[in-house]
Interface confidence: low
């Protein structure tokens, strides 16, 4: 990769809210249709997980099109405001420990563990295999390590110092990486390839964090996740440089990354991804 357009950027983790689609049309690309009108409409962007503006041509298109931002939000996002509960004593835990269990929209029925903020314990639940949220762990031990309090009210292990805990919080699929490294690129680079909800067969690339390489996969045309690139080069640019050597806790992490606004073409949408 050419490095001439890179700069040093301070990396901070950003967390996407849980995504649960009540309708899979929320995963459709924004479709302006064949007509030539200029009408301001809103669509749900599955990658940014937000309702965004687009220009509609006035005819055809698809159902992921709303007259107002409010209508879009009502149809395609769930109100998470009362799902995330934080108290002063709980600040040590990552925010996602306070999310409700979320099986996602698929039907894989995989046994996983989540932190139940009511019982203050990690409990078993059935995960569908896609989407959902980060309160989702492969083992009871990992869940306890990250979200449960120790006997004196503090964390059993500090989130952020345990590599596997970090990885598992980023991807429910629990992609392990060599223990001398931490991943501080976009969290979606750690997610597994996800074909999505539709029936197309488009050639795409995803970043395989186990082997540290971009690999091809077949994309269905809608849904899926952000680990989805139209070229191997785009995939490498977005994800390859995220691995850095571990440093002592508390230090600012600096690593070479792309410019502040890196244009990444993901699935149908072109979105601007702020460096994480």
């Amino acid at each position: 990769d050419s490095e001439e357009d890179e700069e040093h950027t301070i990396i901070t983790d950003t967390e996407l809210p849980p995504l649960k689609l009540m309708h899979s049309f929320c995963a459709f690309k924004a479709d302006d249709g064949p007509c030539k009108a200029i009408m301001k409409r809103f669509f749900f962007n599955i990658f940014t997980r937000q309702c965004e503006e687009f220009i509609y041509g006035g005819c055809e298109g698809n159902q992921n099109r709303f007259e107002s931002l409010e209508e879009c939000k009502k149809m395609c996002t769930r109100d998470n405001a009362n799902r995330i509960i934080k108290t002063t004593l709980q600040q040590e835990k990552p925010d996602f420990c306070f999310l409700e269990e979320d099986p996602g929209i698929c039907r894989g029925y995989i046994t996983r563990y989540f932190y139940n903020n009511q019982t203050k314990q990690c409990e078993r639940f059935k995960y569908g295999g896609c989407l959902g949220n980060m309160n989702n762990f492969e083992t009871l031990e990992e869940c306890k390590n990250i979200c449960e309090d120790g006997p004196n009210g503090f964390q059993v292990d500090n989130y952020g110092t345990q590599l596997n805990a970090v990885n598992n919080s980023l991807t429910p699929q629990s992609t392990k990486v060599p223990s001398l490294f931490e991943f501080h690129g976009p969290s979606w680079c750690l997610t597994p390839a996800d074909r999505g909800l539709c029936r197309a067969n488009e050639n795409r690339f995803y970043y395989n964090s186990v082997i540290g390489k971009c690999r091809p996969f077949k994309y269905s045309g809608c849904g899926g996740n952000e680990n989805n690139f139209t070229s191997k080069q785009e995939c490498l640019r977005a994800c390859k440089k995220g691995f850095i050597q571990r440093i002592s806790k508390g230090g600012l992490i600096k690593t070479k990354r792309k410019r502040k606004k890196q244009r990444v073409k993901i699935a149908y949408e072109e979105i601007f991804v702020k460096n994480m």
Epitope: H23, F25, G61, M75, C198, C222
Partner: antibody
Amino acid sequence: EVQLVESGGGLVQPGGSLRLSCAASGYTFTDYNLDWVRQAPGKGLEWVADINPINGATLYNQKFKGRATISRDNAKNSLYLQMNSLRAEDTAVYYCARYYGDYDAMDYWGQGTLVTVSS
Amino acid sequence: DIVMTQSHKFMSTSVGDRVSITCKASQDVHTAVAWYQQKPGQSPRLLIYWASTRHTGVPDRFTGCGSGTDYTLTISSVQAEDLALYYCQQHYTTPYTFGGGTKLEMK
């Protein structure tokens, strides 16, 4: 076992109103959207409206917007359809159907309730 | 609105025959098509969704295929209990619309 049971059909005068109900059981009510679909005697199926039980967000067939109101009561696991200004052509069997977001299709249907609009 | 056209209102068949019921959309519906079966006096039953995925419990003699505007439901070996009305439906955009139905009857 998923069950959807409609009620509230019957004979209505033209210009009148009626409220159909659908009692859902056998699954978590807020996990799936619910729809109303109607079928005129000897005719095909016609989608009327859809509701997301979690936030009450609705989708309507524009043909019925203004005359039809879909609603739900999560505490009662019930779906409703209020139809106003009824006409003879509204005579149909009205079905309540569970809309499965993964499939984007209606995977369970009630037995239907017949609405007859006649003077 | 998207119009779903089932060109054959009736199709005659015999037990053991292979039969294909077609459905044409007035615009590309991107495989967002479901097929339903309705027997006399009964409510519709979901057979196929996303054009080709069989719903739970549906016998494997039922298959769906298609893309763009053209979709087909095929019954590989018709059984007596398959005699019914078959509807296609697009769920690409609202209003969700159904085809007029194809009635499968015995020769």
